[in-house]
Amino acid sequence: MKSGLWYFFLFCLRIKVLTGEINGSANYEMFIFHNGGVQILCKYPDIVQQFKMQLLKGGQILCDLTKTKGSGNTVSIKSLKFCHSQLSNNSVSFFLYNLDHSHANYYFCNLSIFDPPPFKVTLTGGYLHIYESQLCCQLKFWLPIGCAAFVVVCILGCILICWLTKKKYSSSVHDPNGEYMFMRAVNTAKKSRLTDVTL
């Protein structure tokens, strides 16, 4: 049942990416939808040795990753605003989960290049649009109505069954033949009691 609901959720949430609408828009597929979440791909040139990559949602810093090297060429990777991220030799991927309408926004990859010099900042981005498919919307509209109707039918059914049961019971009580049989039983009981007293 749980997996069924999950697949329904996956089916309902679709992601559309509108790039090229902003300056410095990504010239690659920036958003990759999978497992009910989105992978936001922030690329950097292979030559870059040390950098800071920030994921911005509008103007807010959601995630960051900094890669530096020490005097012994030892690599240090830090995150001040931690997100699930993945580093490769030419990209940083940030992962966002449990998507809903509030995630729909402009997302930017803010790259600060420390090494090689000169220090440089580049901004690339795109719009992450989360929409529901027509069928999903129809389902979402009719599902509660259907459920409500089902509940109403169940209640009405219960009422009807109760009423029929009551009717059947009351009809057996008011049957003339039945009444005579009942009276006979009462009379017989009365007589036996009187006999007991007499004796």
Partner: antibody, heavy 117, light 111 residues
Amino acid sequence: EVQLVESGGGLVQPGGSLRLSCAASGFTFSDYWMDWVRQAPGKGLVWVSNIDEDGSITEYSPFVKGRFTISRDNAKNTLYLQMNSLRAEDTAVYYCTRWGRFGFDSWGQGTLVTVSS
Amino acid sequence: DIVMTQSPDSLAVSLGERATINCKSSQSLLSGSFNYLTWYQQKPGQPPKLLIFYASTRETGVPDRFSGSGSGTDFTLTISSLQAEDVAVYYCHHHYNAPPTFGPGTKVDIK
């Protein structure tokens, strides 16, 4: 302007301990790896130790490993070098340096450590 | 550990003349497209100063008479026209791996 000011040097007996400090200003201290480099009187430069931005990575020269400990306090913008079991060959001017991504781009004036009985 | 050697130990050059310092590493300092070699200048009574990084890139504010060249294991620092303020000891240094090491230095004087 980047400034690095070392302190804590002085005369110490062999086997003794000393703690050097380096007060940093003029830059975001927590964004940089920091190093200690020493220079014996009339000799060349020798790298001693380094530490990454938050202190989670430290490295040491084979000459001082196990005897010296590098640390930092980013809240105080200060770099430290705890020197134990000092030897005569540790006598040198100790420089605090900023590793500026691809070279030691800022140096303090140095503090002299003399190990002698 | 990588061993750095420099030659000559010292040299005296006339003002305006060219000074050339050589540095050799015991193994290649080339990684990708970068040579992990830097040059420092240390004037008497002063701390060292970064001149050249990645074997050939001048640090900001360093006069263009200073230039670096070489790749792999052999590197050169050239002062194209020696000035009085260039009197110093020059060190090469690698940061290819840990521990980073310095060359023994080359002292440059005016003839």
